[in-house]
Each structure stands twice: as C-alpha cells, then as structure tokens.
C-alpha cells in the first residue's frame, strides 16, 4: 500500500474581504483511519481552524460531507473573510489513537485577503495661510490588502507632483495604511479651489476612491483697503467711505476712529460673494465739518479673521472752504499693497501671511 500523502494543490489563494475562501486538501489513502484538522501557522502557537473530530467552528464548513463513504476530500470553506484571516493554512492528517496522533501535514496554502482601502480622508492645515504661501494637505486611507497601491493628488483637476507618500507597515501585515502629504502653493484665486486625493487599488476594479478638501478652509485672502471722500454735502457733512475688497473669509470687523477715538464698529455679515469667492464691503462715515475747528483725522481700522488690525487713514481738511474742496481727496497714505499698510503716523507696520 502506498504511503498516505496529504495534498494541498494550491500554494496560495487570494480572496476579497467579505467573500468565502475555499482551501483544498485531499488525502491519497483512507489508511490510516483518523481525522483531519486545519491549522493556521506552524509550531506550538499554531491556531486550530477546523477539526473534523471535535469543536465548534461557525465560519468553517467542510466542502465534502465528512460522513461520506470513502471520503478523502478534506477541503474547507471559510466564510466572511477579513484581513485578519490572512496566513498560511495547513491540512493535517491524524491517526486514530488516545489521543489521536499527528501523522502528516500538507504543504500549506497561503491565504491572502484583498481588502478595499477605506475612503480617503483629506485634512488641511490647522491655520489659514495667505497667497504665495505653501500649505500641506494630508490624505489617509486604511485597511487595504495587498500592499500595492497608487495615490495621486490633484488641484482643480491638475495633477500635483510635490507630495510624499508612505505605506505602513513596511513588512508583512494582514492590512496596510497609506498616508500622503501634498504641498500646495496658494494663490488669491484659490477660494473656490479643491484638492483631491485619489487612491487606486486592485480591489477597486479601476474605479479609484477620492477624498477632497476645499482650499477655502486653508486660505486667507487679506483685504485691500481704500478710503475716499465724496463731495461735501450742502449741510456741511462729508461722506467718507472705506472700501474693503477681495477678502476671504467673511469674518471681518471694521472700526471708524475720529482723531483716534472710536466712532463706530461694524461686523460684516451676509455679504454677497464675488465670482472668485472673495467678499467686498463698503462702510461710510458722515463727518459734520462745522463741528470741528481743526482738520479731522479719520481712520478705517479693519480686523480680518482674527489677524492684527489694518489701518487706513484720511484727513478731512476743515480749514479749506467746503465749496472749494475736491470731490475725491485721496487718503494721505496711498503707497499700499495688498499686504503692507501704514497708518499716517507710521506707528505700526503690519505684514500679513
């Protein structure tokens, strides 16, 4: 009689998470009598997966009826596979005894589990940054297997190249995680921009997963300030306007100062949005010229999104005859750009990022 062989025909089997895995095993002889057991791993720490003789194995079903006459098929089916089921499975023949004695093992079948990555989660910087600055976005996805995975970044549909990606762990594992950090240079036009993290994996059948983040959460566009005087009214009142333009987010507080004293404070709310996502706001102040003997120094002070205040000052010339006054006298400090503003006294210099 030929010696018993335990044959596991497949060296490896790959199964999608949630599906069933069939692990094949046949014996070449009915002799000797004794049960089959399936183990994951080898050595003293091996895990019993199924025993024909005894035990409760709710997820494991023998492929062939164990009571079938002449049965030499000891294949099993494991249901509802998860990444934790990955490993090498051994079909082991025992000889009947008290207790049964291990006789021969199959060569083993490695079960790998194809698990889909979780939906990518994109997170942006904790604090806002201004145009021309670089911010980092992080994309994370977890629980996938096998390890091979492709991650791409896009900004408004254009692929980005400045990013770094890590897949963990480096060694063998039941499942893996990916983390990628992309560096994005902001522009003033990015309020409506979006970054997309795209993950492609064998389990996704060519339909990648995407995570998105809006740059509106990461950007601050500081306002332009312009203070102008309208024509003197017949009642000796001057209408001075402060135009605050192209700012984002909307959170903004404007304070009028007359000769350094607070005249009025306003909070921006429910402003219409510009096409580029920024906001404009105009505030005006009526100054009664006849109530002043000296020139009146008006300051429009804007505090945007919790940043240090930006001042723009304007002097209303009381000494000049109202009728002769120009309709659009400019503010004293006109040498400003979108980031740097000086008040008249050059007391403060504010640089905004």
């Amino acid at each position: 009689e030929e010696e018993l062989q335990v044959i596991q025909p497949e060296k490896s089997v790959s199964v999608a998470a949630g599906e069933s895995a069939t692990l094949n095993c046949t014996a070449t002889s009915l002799i000797p009598v004794g049960p089959i057991q399936w183990f994951r791993g080898v050595g003293p720490g091996r895990e019993l997966i199924y025993s024909q003789k005894e035990g409760h194995f709710p997820r494991v079903t023998p492929v062939s009826d164990p009571t079938k006459r002449n049965n030499m098929d000891f294949s099993i089916r494991i249901s509802n596979i998860t990444p934790a089921d990955a490993g090498t499975y051994y079909c082991v023949k025992f000889r009947k005894g008290s207790p049964d004695v291990e006789l021969k093992s199959g060569a083993g079948t490695e079960l790998s589990v194809r698990a889909k990555p979780s939906a990518p989660v994109v997170s942006g910087p904790a604090v806002r940054a201004t145009a021309e600055h670089t911010v980092s976005f992080t994309c994370e996805s977890h629980g996938f297997s096998p390890r091979d995975i492709t991650l791409k970044w896009f900004k408004n549909g254009n692929e980005l190249s400045d990013f770094q990606t890590n897949v963990d762990p480096a060694g063998k594992s039941v499942s893996y995680s990916i983390r990628s950090t992309a560096r994005v240079v902001l522009t003033r036009r990015d309020v409506h921009s979006q970054v997309i993290c795209e993950v492609a994996h064998v389990t996704l059948q060519g339909d990648p997963l995407r995570g998105t983040a809006n740059l509106s959460e990461a950007i601050r566009v500081p306002p332009f300030l312009e203070v102008t005087q309208q024509s003197m009214r017949a009642d000796n009142q001057v209408n001075v306007t402060c135009q605050v333009t192209k700012f984002y987010p909307q959170r903004l507080q404007l304070t009028w100062l007359e000769n350094g004293n607070v005249s009025r404070t306003e909070m921006a709310s429910a402003l219409p949005e510009n096409k580029d996502g920024t906001y404009n706001w105009t505030s005006w102040l009526l100054v009664n010229v006849s109530a002043h003997r000296d020139d009146v120094k008006l300051t429009c002070q804007v505090e945007h999104d919790g940043q240090p205040a930006v001042n723009k000052s304007f002097s209303v010339k009381v000494s000049a005859h109202p009728k002769e006054q120009g309709s659009n006298t400019a503010a004293e400090n006109t040498g400003t750009n979108e980031r740097d503003y000086k008040d008249d006294d050059d007391k403060h210099h504010h640089h905004h990022h």
């Epitope: 009598v33 079938k68 006459r69 009947k96």
Partner: antibody, heavy 119, light 110 residues
Framework: QVQLVQSGAEVKKPGASVKVSCKAS????????INWVRQAPGQGLEWIAM????????HYNQIFKDRATLTTDTSTSTAYMELRSLRSDDTAVYYC????????????WGRGTLVTVSS | DIVLTQSPDSLAVSLGERATINCRAS??????????IFWYQQKPGQPPKLLIY???NRDSGVPDRFSGSGSGTDFTLTISSLQAEDVAVYYC????????FGQGTKLEIK
C-alpha cells in the same frame, strides 16, 4: 476521548416497543455515523442499522427494516434506536458504535443495553 | 447480500503459538483499491473491539502480534504468538456493501 453512554436495561412484554439511547461525547456528533448492533445471549453479532446524525440518512438491515427506527437529537448528541413489535427472540444486548473513518466499520462502542422480552 | 463464513468455529492454541482464523466472503469485498474487511475481538462481558481495518491495518493500540491479510474473498487474521489475554471470540465484518458479520470464531488456550 470518545465515549458512548447507553441507557439502562429494559424488560418488555412481547408486542411492546423499546427505545434505547446512546449519548455521545468527546467528538463532533454530526461528523460520524452511528451503528446499532445486537447480540443475542451466546450468539454472534448482528448489524441492525446506521444513521448519519448530520442529515438523518439511514441504512437498515433488511431484516429490521419494518420494525426498527433510528433517530438522533443533535442538541444533546444522542442517538436512539426504537424496536417495535418485540418478540422473545429480540432478547439481546443492543450496542451503539461510532464509525470513526466513514468506512462503515465500528471503531468505538457503547457498553451495551440488555433488552429482555418476556411475558 | 454478502455472506461471511468464518473457519474454524472454535480454535484451541497453545500459549506462544500461532493462531490463524479465516474469513471467506460469498463475493469479492474489494473495491476502490481497498479490501473492505474488518476484524473485531470480543472478550466475555465486553463490547467488541476493532483490531484490523481494511483487511491489513492494525487499529491504534493493537499489539503487533495481530495481523490481517488477504484480498478478494479470502481473508486471514493471524496472532503470531498467543497470549493468555487473547482468549476471546473474533469476528470478521465486511462493508463493501452494508455491514455484515461472520458468525464468530472462539479462540481458547490449549
């Protein structure tokens, strides 16, 4: 360790029925056939029938086909053999035996239940 | 049905001597490359005990003085050196079809 524990001795009158139980332990009850064999005093072994507890498939010796019924209760891992219309020549020790190799053989035996049929 | 006939019905052998029991089937019990014959030993007041399965394979814990041989229709159980504890009735059983037993052979010490 495989164990088959049988019910106690019975005394029955001719024409009556007897139901012998066999409680299994030490193995997965539904994975192995249970056989029933009897032995009249001073006589040889006589196979009665076998049952697969997983699906209650049965095979009977033609001699007992009309009088014997095998059943199992998988919740208690117990096999039963009922014999009806008893006659005096049914007096015997009734054994249950487990087939460990699915070879239609008897690897592990209960200790037997003596059924005496007497008027 | 297959009928099994054992011979002799009884046998007396001296301690240490060889004992041979035969079992003949009314038709071949070979199938699928196996000979479907089993041998049991039954001592007084005890249930039978499996000795040999598939004609020639000793069950676990069975001393190696017991051996089985044969094929087709003729089979033999041999005890190479009889021990006092071997006194018993020996039965052959076939399972090529549904199980049937031989009538038994009583083995005693001479």
């Amino acid at each position: 360790q495989v164990q088959l524990v049988q019910s106690g001795a019975e005394v029955k009158k001719p024409g009556a029925s007897v139901k012998v139980s066999c409680k299994a332990s030490g193995y997965t009850f539904t994975n192995y056939w249970i056989n029933w064999v009897r032995q009249a005093p001073g006589q040889g072994l006589e196979w009665i029938a076998m049952i697969d507890p997983s699906d209650s498939e049965t095979h009977y010796n033609q001699i007992f086909k009309d009088r014997a019924t095998l059943t199992t209760d998988t919740s208690t891992s117990t096999a039963y053999m009922e014999l009806r219309s008893l006659r005096s020549d049914d007096t015997a020790v009734y054994y249950c035996a487990m087939d460990y190799g699915s070879l239609y053989a008897m690897d592990y035996w209960g200790r037997g239940t003596l059924v005496t049929v007497s008027s | 049905d297959i009928v099994l006939t054992q011979s002799p019905d009884s046998l007396a052998v001296s301690l240490g001597e060889r004992a041979t029991i035969n079992c003949r089937a009314s038709k071949s019990v070979s199938s699928s490359g196996y000979n479907w014959i089993f041998w049991y030993q039954q001592k007084p007041g005890q249930p039978p005990k499996l000795l040999i399965y598939l004609a020639s394979n000793r069950d676990s814990g069975v001393p190696d003085r017991f051996s089985g041989s044969g094929s087709g229709t003729d089979f033999t159980l041999t005890i190479s050196s009889l021990q006092a504890e071997d006194v018993a009735v020996y039965y052959c059983q076939e399972s090529r079809e549904l199980p049937t037993f031989g009538q038994g052979t009583k083995l005693e010490i001479k």
